[in-house]
């Protein structure tokens, strides 16, 4: 495939990636499964300037991230470590709360209405972002 | 590479007491919430109790409720079982666990 | 309290042989369900997560399904290193309840 060069119409570029911001809400799942078939991700936060601009674009809304628990390791969908990389938790977060009586506790995680992070029921319909990077190759073929 | 180590059983006579500790490495332990359980001699496994990452969120089973008591210290990784007003049917291993990983286990004896 | 049932208790296998374990909750508890290998004298080691999520670096001759009440764990090719105790165990809800083990030993 060759070379995405630069962001599809309705994306938004910065710092060699492109993102692309949900009006409307999905549960974690099936946020994940959209940008996968947009042939990118839920976004992967590696740092306070990506969170920063992220935070610009969603406003003070729930926010589903490339983040979570569910076999028992917090695990980022694109591969990037948990363990060394950036984290912006509210305090007292994440709690893997299972006081909503929903069943299971939290295992995905979200922006919340101040930008930092909550883990959440992943049922929940939040609104969501993918993330893609530019020079990564594309699945389309090239333009002859 | 996550490495969770149990230490503090021993014999005790019923009655007694224990403090159980865990000590965690490898991970952000602050981030999980953390288990003790526990598999009595030739047993099946038996969970005792459950702590969220904040320390806002605890479980006990019915069968130690009002004995023992779980905390943990996240500047220090580690994570505490006290048992109190111990009991026979108390021996057991006791395991210090996250939902996927546990640890090997220390051994509790409760007999006069 | 959900109840978890396993079966078979024991159950006795060849090496190369398909082994099938079904565990059922009392109750519906999707799929957050758990299986676990022990053996003797050793710590329960994570198989599976999420009912069908196989933990890393778990063989894929591992492979758990189900959803709401019934679920199976399934080795398609025994191997020696196999033979051992497993255990389901739910996380729907607390207190946190096991199924009572289904010994796998050698034929």
């Known amino acids: 495939g060759s070379e995405r060069t630069c962001c599809p119409v309705n994306w938004v570029e910065h710092e060699r990636s492109c993102y692309w911001f949900s009006r409307s809400g999905k549960a974690w799942a099936d946020a994940d499964n959209y940008c996968r078939l947009e042939d990118a991700h839920l976004v992967v936060v590696t740092s306070w300037e990506e969170q920063k601009f992220v935070q610009h674009h969603i406003g003070p809304v729930n926010t589903w991230m490339g983040l979570h628990d569910q076999n028992g390791p917090w695990k980022w969908v694109d591969g990037t470590d948990y363990e060394t990389g950036f984290k912006n938790w509210r305090p007292e977060q994440p709690d893997d709360w299972y006081g909503h009586g929903l069943g299971g506790g939290e295992d995905c995680a979200h922006f919340t209405d101040d930008g930092r992070w909550n883990d959440d029921v992943c049922q929940r319909p939040y609104r969501w972002v993918c993330e893609t990077e530019l020079d990564k190759a594309s699945q389309e073929p090239p333009l002859l | 590479e996550v490495q969770l180590v149990e230490s503090g059983g021993g014999l005790v006579k019923p009655g007694g007491s224990l403090r159980l500790s865990c000590a965690a490495s490898?991970?952000?332990?602050?981030?999980?919430?953390m288990n003790w359980f526990r598999q009595a001699p030739g047993k099946g496994l038996e969970w005792v109790s459950s702590?969220?990452?904040?320390?806002?969120?605890?479980y006990y089973a019915d069968s130690v409720k009002g004995r023992f008591t779980i905390s943990r210290d996240n500047a220090e990784n580690s994570l505490y079982l006290q048992m109190n007003s111990l009991r026979a049917e108390d021996t057991a291993v006791y395991y210090c666990?996250?939902?996927?990983?546990w640890g090997q286990g220390t051994l509790v004896t409760v007999s006069s | 309290d959900i109840q978890m049932t396993q079966s078979p208790s024991s159950l006795s296998a060849s090496v190369g042989d398909r082994v099938t374990i079904t565990c059922r909750a009392s109750?519906?508890?999707?799929?957050?369900l758990a299986w676990f290998q022990q053996k003797p004298g050793k710590a329960p080691k994570s198989l599976i997560s999420?009912?069908?999520s196989l933990q890393s670096g778990v063989p894929s001759k591992f492979s758990g399904s189900g959803s709401g009440t019934e679920f199976t764990l399934t080795i398609s090719s025994l191997q020696p290193e196999d033979f051992a105790t497993y255990y389901c165990q739910q996380y729907y809800s607390y207190p946190l309840t096991f199924g009572g083990g289904t010994k796998v030993e050698i034929k």
């Open positions: 666990a996250r939902r996927d990983f």
């Open positions: 490898g991970f952000t332990f602050s981030s999980y919430r």
């Open positions: 999420a009912a069908s």
């Open positions: 702590i969220s990452g904040s320390s806002t969120d605890i």
């Open positions: 109750q519906a508890i999707n799929t957050y």
